[in-house]
Structures are given as structure tokens and as C-alpha cells.
């Protein structure tokens, strides 16, 4: 029986050219996390496997950094980074948990007014 829940940063906005941390947290379960996939719509951004560690897609290597923890840091943001991001937690013995984050990348002047959505 799956008892866990995924908490995410939810809907966030960030400034063009800036950085943002995509963070998911699995709680209310003692299941072992065997792998986390970070996906953006139809693309695999990164995988963190308990046995193999991190692997980042070459397409994003210059702009994506692993961590903190099982999160993902996106750098040098562009408007094209706007969209849905998914953290997919594969666990033993529970199975799979999925979290969703919507990121909106704004032009600098607009982002200043939406600063309340920024991650410190």
C-alpha cells in the first residue's frame, strides 16, 4: 500500500537569466528511493539512481546541476524553460510517486513583481 506523498514547490516563477531550484520531497513513507527521474514534458532531464548516482542529459549539462539533495537546479533560464516539470520517485517497496511543478520564466521587469513566488 502506498502511504507516501510528494510535496513540491508547486507553481513558481523566475527571472530570465536567473536560476531556480526544482524540489520534490517524499514524505509519510519509509520506502527506499531507488531512482528519481526529472522530466520536462517529453524530455528526460536527469536521473539520480541510488546505485549509479546522477546522470544529466548532455542537452542540459551546461544549465542543469544536480541537487540540492534529489532536487535539480536550473541555471541561465530562458523563456523556453517555461512549462511543466515532473519528479518521478521510484521506491521500494511502495512503487512510483510523481510530483508536478509548473515553472514560468518571466522577463526581468515582470519577475520583479512576481518575486513572492521565487525560491530564496
Amino acid at each position: 500500500m502506498m502511504t507516501g506523498t510528494i510535496e513540491t514547490t508547486g507553481n513558481i516563477s523566475a527571472e530570465k537569466g536567473g536560476s531556480i531550484i526544482l524540489q520534490c520531497h517524499l514524505s509519510s513513507t519509509t520506502a527506499q528511493v531507488t531512482q528519481v527521474n526529472w522530466e520536462q514534458q517529453d524530455q528526460l532531464l536527469a536521473i539520480c539512481n541510488a546505485d549509479l548516482g546522477w546522470h544529466i542529459s548532455p542537452s542540459f549539462k551546461d544549465r542543469v546541476a544536480p541537487g540540492p539533495g534529489l532536487g535539480l537546479t536550473l541555471q541561465s533560464l530562458t523563456v523556453n524553460d517555461t512549462g511543466e516539470y515532473f519528479c518521478i520517485y521510484h521506491t521500494y517497496p511502495d512503487g512510483t510517486y510523481t510530483g508536478r511543478i509548473f515553472l514560468e520564466v518571466l522577463e526581468s521587469s515582470v519577475a520583479e513583481h512576481g518575486a513572492r513566488f521565487q525560491i530564496p
Epitope: L44, N49, Y92, G95
Partner: nanobody, 115 residues
Framework: EVQLVESGGGLVQAGGSLRLSCAAS??????MGWFRQAPGKEREFLAI???????LYADSVKGRFTISADNAKNTVYLQMNSLKPEDTAVYYC???????????WGQGTQVTVSS
Amino acid sequence: EVQLVESGGGLVQAGGSLRLSCAASGRTYYAMGWFRQAPGKEREFLAIITDGSKTLYADSVKGRFTISADNAKNTVYLQMNSLKPEDTAVYYCAAQFTLARHLVWGQGTQVTVSS
């Protein structure tokens, strides 16, 4: 018992192609990957494919190697083109199976690229 069986290795001339296969018996996987280890070197990650057919490659092989899956046969392939002598190594597949604690590794298949 879950097993991975690799095949398709062999001797090929530089510039040639090979297709490796990795057949998984028994269980469904949510990620399968290919790795290689040359003599005296560390194991190197090459490519991984998820159960949703999303792929991720190492810089060293992107554009030359292609990972794909036949879910009906529970088999993952590595198509290797434009092979170079430095691609000579033992190639291993690994699978993260659903509801399993750790990766399962295949026994490896030798690939030798002659100049």
C-alpha cells in the same frame, strides 16, 4: 530469478556498426542502461532508457549510439555506429526493475574495434 542476457558483441572494423541486445527475463523494468569498461579503466555510462521510452546519453556517444527498447520482448538495444578503436571494451547492460532495491547487471559482451 531476474536475469539480463547480453548479445551482439564481436570484432568489427573501425567505421563499422554493431547492435547489442539485452534481454530481461521475468520482471518489468523502469530503467535500463548500457555501460562499458575498457581494460584498466573505470566503468563508463553510455545511455539509459526509461519505461516511457525517454532516453539520456553520455556526451561521448551522443549522435553515434542509439538506445531503444522493444517492450513486448522486454529487450533493450544499443545501436553503435561509426565505431572507433577506443570503443573497444566489455559492454554491460543494467536494469532497475520495478519493486527492486538494486540494479541488476548483465554478464557483459566484448566489443573489439580494429583499426
